[in-house]
């Protein structure tokens, strides 16, 4: 049903009115306003921006806008004792030092409080030793080093290129390999698109540019000192030794000019194959240590950053629902940035601001949504999703009972090629239907729908004529809502052409060069892609908050469950002999998926036919839809990851950014051939199949007729 059938909505106040009110020029103006100075989490500047947003959201017409503060563990460089890396000679003299800061972009030379590049939460230390180049420091890279090349990283400083996987996973892998320090760098192969100039003349990373970022392995815990509970005034805090997810070895990021100086001297083993070579004019030798003439030289890290409990501020705005005020649709994105945040996060925050303004305009004209809409400006996302997680921990009882959906709103763009959507299968049909109604901003698709350009440029690998929609992973503020609480979630942004641009993320990610001018000059001068993303995000929120029947299709979950079951079965079948030996069967899982499919189909039929004028039945059906995502939550969580509780999806254990399906089974099967006790390992596989089958069956039963 269309939105304008909801209670007390005049024909004027429908989705079209909301979308028409969104203006590219406003998004541009908001982006400029949000990016003139740094807004690092825990700083006065970011507190002032929180208060500004609170004030403006009130002016826009929200019913209430409050600040929610928490005292969480953050990390900062020592202002008087900078972090750097040296090459030292046999006498211990520093003969080369990496740069202490990024050369500031034009127009920003006099800006104060630009935090120098650092790896947030690195411990202090000054390790020195031989260097080992470990490619991307992925699980498979360490397998190649240790198992195939017999190279031991124990007691070595490793240098890894950014990209492919979350930096925290790289550090964890290096720690497990016995390294005593990690140097992260941006290789031009991953952060320099051919044929494009470096900033300020283009959108590529200059040699002195460096990616900041946290290196935690929180696994959804939020504040490292208060896992599971809000970091409020009366919180009990763990000691730093018991803190969740902190790295144990020093880590520091550098740019490719500095990396060249370290890598050009590398000796030892040649790279195992061309996939280990980047684009620098260096041999990409693995090491350990430097080549002949330089073999007595070592690398020394100087890391003096400190971890500090610091106050952060979320801004929470409420637009009360007219009919179901106890049902919450949440639009949230973060406000804190590493430096100027030209893309991350302010291209998203500017879009949220304009969405709030549009909703506020409608509200001032007498309209209200059917359900309550909550708007959030999260703090400390860059330090481990802390603001969103602490707020969700504080409000978990309300959220698990009342949370309909969460739409994330970080960076609106990471390119300007086509749309990118990651969401729960429940939202597939919502996204399809919405994008069919929106105009494409793409060149060559004038007068065509967004759905059409998106499908053409990013086709689904499985279904012809449909666009690709990806699994949710993590690395952003939807994590606690989806992976811990089981609230249906989605995210949308404009992205690059993944086929022609193989660099990871966008080149200037988390660098000082992520400025307003980067967006205005190179990515989206007309702000038409930002406007499209605002229409997608805002349109999803509008429909979720306003449609009489929730716009969730449970049949799409049935389809993916079958696909995921097939996939995990085929992984297991790479070990046919062991499956036979240990009597491993997937019958229970396939049976549960079959039951889910049948029950979902019958539920969908009932959804078409029931009496929508009966508020009790309507509420009952909507609750079944709302609670379906919740039904995939296992209260015990995944093994060793208690805050990842979704049985169908979790962030990959090898890459936080990526989503893994049936993660419990997947992890049990991973590298199973190397396990010392195969009987125990296959026993765990069987247990995980049992948990997955039970959960799918239990979820199916929530869709059965209630009596």
């Amino acid at each position: 049903k269309s939105s304008n059938e909801a209670t007390n909505i005049t024909p004027k106040h429908n989705m079209k009115a909301f979308l028409d009110e969104l203006k590219a020029e406003n998004i541009k103006k908001f982006l400029y306003n949000f990016t003139q100075i740094p807004h690092l989490a825990g700083t006065e500047q970011n507190f002032q921006l929180a208060k500004q947003i609170q004030s403006q959201w009130k002016e826009f017409g929200l019913d209430s806008v409050e600040l929610a503060h928490y005292d969480v563990l953050l990390s900062y460089p020592n202002k008087t004792h900078p972090n750097y890396i040296s090459i030292i000679n046999e006498d211990g003299n520093e003969i080369f030092n990496t740069s202490l800061f990024e050369p500031p972009p034009p127009g920003y030379e006099n800006v104060s409080d630009i935090v120098p590049p650092f790896s947030a939460f690195s411990p202090q230390g000054m390790p020195e030793g031989d260097l080992v180049y470990v490619n991307y420091a992925r699980t498979e890279d360490f397998f190649k080093l240790e198992r195939d090349m017999k190279i031991n990283c124990s007691g070595k400083i490793v240098i890894a290129r950014y990209g492919k996987v979350f930096r925290g996973n790289k550090v964890k892998n290096a720690q497990l390999a016995g390294a005593k320090g990690v140097i992260l760098y941006s290789d031009p192969a991953d952060y320099f698109a051919p044929g494009v100039k470096s900033y300020p003349d283009g959108w590529n990373l200059p040699g002195g540019g460096v990616q900041r970022g946290n290196i935690l392995n929180l696994n959804g815990a939020g504040d490292p000192l208060t896992p599971g509970y809000p970091a409020n005034e009366y919180a009990y805090r763990r000691g730093i030794a018991e803190a969740v997810g902190l790295p144990s070895i020093p880590v520091h990021p550098i740019g490719y000019y500095d990396a060249q100086k370290l890598l050009e001297k590398m000796g030892g083993s040649a790279p195992p194959d061309s996939s280990w070579r980047g684009s620098l004019k260096v041999p990409y030798n693995v090491g350990p240590g430097f080549t002949g003439n330089f073999s007595t030289q070592k690398v020394k890290m100087h890391i003096h950053s400190t971890n500090e409990v610091t106050r952060i501020y979320n801004v929470i705005g409420t637009l009360r629902g007219a009919v179901e005020p106890d049902r919450y649709v949440i639009l949230g994105g973060h406000r804190d940035s590493w430096v100027f945040g030209g893309i991350d996060p302010q291209s998203g925050a500017a879009v949220v601001h304009e969405i709030v303004r549009s909703f506020g305009t409608l509200k001032k004209e007498g309209w209200r949504p059917r359900r309550t809409i909550l708007f959030a400006s999260w703090d400390a996302e860059e330090f481990g999703l802390l603001g969103s997680t602490e707020w969700a921990e504080e409000n978990s009882r309300l959220l698990q009972e009342r949370g309909v959906a969460y739409i994330n709103a970080d960076s609106s763009i990471e390119g300007n090629y086509t749309l990118r959507v990651d969401c729960t299968p429940l939202m597939y049909s919502l996204v399809h239907n919405l994008t069919k109604e929106l105009k494409s901003p793409d060149e060559g698709f004038e007068g065509k729908s967004l759905y059409e350009s998106w499908t053409k440029k990013s086709p689904s690998p499985e279904f012809s004529g449909m666009p690709r929609i990806s699994k949710l992973g993590s690395g952003n503020d939807f994590e606690v809502f989806f992976q811990r609480l089981g609230i249906a979630s989605g995210r949308a942004r404009y992205t690059k052409n993944w086929e022609t641009n193989k660099f990871s993320g966008y080149p200037l990610y988390h660098s000082v060069y992520e400025t307003y001018e980067l967006v205005e000059k190179f990515y989206d001068p007309m702000f038409k892609y930002h406007l499209t993303v605002a229409q997608v995000r805002g349109g999803m929120v509008f429909e979720l908050a306003n449609s009489i029947v929730l716009p969730f299709d449970c049949r799409d979950y049935a389809v993916v469950l079958r696909k995921y079951a097939d996939k995990i079965y085929s992984i297991s079948m790479k070990h046919p002999q062991e499956m036979k030996t240990y009597s491993v069967s997937f019958d229970s899982l396939f049976s549960a998926v079959k039951n889910f499919t049948e029950i979902a189909s019958k539920f969908s039929e009932r959804l078409q036919d029931f009496d929508k004028s009966n508020p009790i039945v309507l509420r009952m059906m909507n609750d079944q839809l709302m609670f379906l995502e919740r039904a995939f939550i296992d209260p015990l969580g995944l093994p060793d990851r208690p805050f990842y509780r979704h049985v169908i999806y979790a962030p990959s254990s090898h890459n936080k950014y990526a989503g893994e399906s049936f993660p419990g089974i997947y992890d049990a099967l991973f590298d199973i051939e190397s396990k010392v006790d195969p009987s125990k390992a296959w026993g765990e596989v069987k247990r995980q199949i049992y948990v997955a089958a039970f959960t799918v069956q239990a979820a199916a039963e929530t869709l059965s007729e209630v009596a």
Epitope: F96, F192, G207, S279, K281, V282, Y284
Partner: antibody
Framework: QVQLVQSGAEVKKPGASVKLSCKAS????????INWVRQTPEQGLEWMGG????????NYNENFKGRVTMTRDTSNSTAYMELSRLRSDDTAVYYC?????????????WGQGTTVTVSS | DIVMTQTPLSLPVTLGDPASISCRSS???????????LNWYQQRPGQSPRLLIY???NRFSGVPDRFSGSGSGTDFTLKISRVEAEDVGVYYC?????????FGQGTKLEIK
């Protein structure tokens, strides 16, 4: 605007040494190697070697080893090239040139050249 | 050392006509990372050399698009689509794949 400014012309006697300077501006000196290239009508352009200002590491062309010494002073962003035991065939224009680093890995900026005349 | 051989050594051209210079290296200039560090320099009369083309075919900033480079392995070409008066000078190919870096003998372009 990247600039390399070289010292003035030199006249030397055979067997003497000459030390040329190259002052860099408009960029971060320690990020880019400085090459020295000489030009004679007979030999054309000839790469003599290079220095990494960051760590002082040098790389010399075998043809000049034992006679050439490259140094740098990072405090004033200046590179130096000293050529000893001069011969008449060392008469040439000597250029310093910045090694452009990624993505170029070519000499992307050149000094104006210093004429060295070796004559008895 | 890698020997770079240019042909022709002298190239008289009519204004507006195309010009082509060849450069051959004594061994492959492909570096282990897959890139080929073959560069072209222009030296106008009385001036220092200036970078025109890097990595075989990439124009350096400010270089007009009438200049183009091509080739692979050991055989390379510099083309000028329509020669202008300011193009007069000596053109050098050079390799920075292997140490020592080496240059071709130069090709003198003059106007007929």
């Amino acid at each position: 605007q990247v600039q390399l400014v070289q010292s003035g012309a030199e006249v030397k006697k055979p067997g003497a040494s000459v030390k040329l300077s190259c002052k860099a501006s408009g960029y971060t000196f320690t990020y880019f190697d400085i090459n020295w290239v000489r030009q004679t009508p007979e030999q054309g352009l000839e790469w003599m070697g290079g220095i990494s200002p960051g760590d002082g590491n040098t790389n010399y062309n075998e043809n000049f080893k034992g006679r050439v010494t490259m140094t740098r002073d990072t405090s004033n962003s200046t590179a130096y090239m000293e050529l000893s035991r001069l011969r008449s065939d060392d008469t040439a224009v000597y250029y310093c040139a910045r090694d452009g680093n990624f993505p170029y890995y070519a000499m992307d900026s050149w000094g104006q050249g210093t004429t060295v005349t070796v004559s008895s | 050392d890698i020997v770079m051989t240019q042909t022709p050594l002298s190239l008289p051209v009519t204004l507006g006509d195309p010009a082509s210079i060849s450069c051959r290296s004594s061994q492959s200039l492909v570096y282990s990372n897959g890139n080929t560090y073959l560069n072209w320099y222009q030296q106008r009369p009385g001036q220092s050399p200036r970078l025109l083309i890097y990595k075989v075919s990439n124009r350096f900033s400010g270089v007009p698009d009438r200049f183009s480079g091509s080739g692979s392995g050991t055989d390379f070409t510099l083309k000028i689509s329509r020669v202008e008066a300011e193009d007069v000078g000596v053109y050098y190919c050079s390799q920075s794949t292997h140490v020592p870096y080496t240059f071709g003998q130069g090709t003198k372009l003059e106007i007929k």
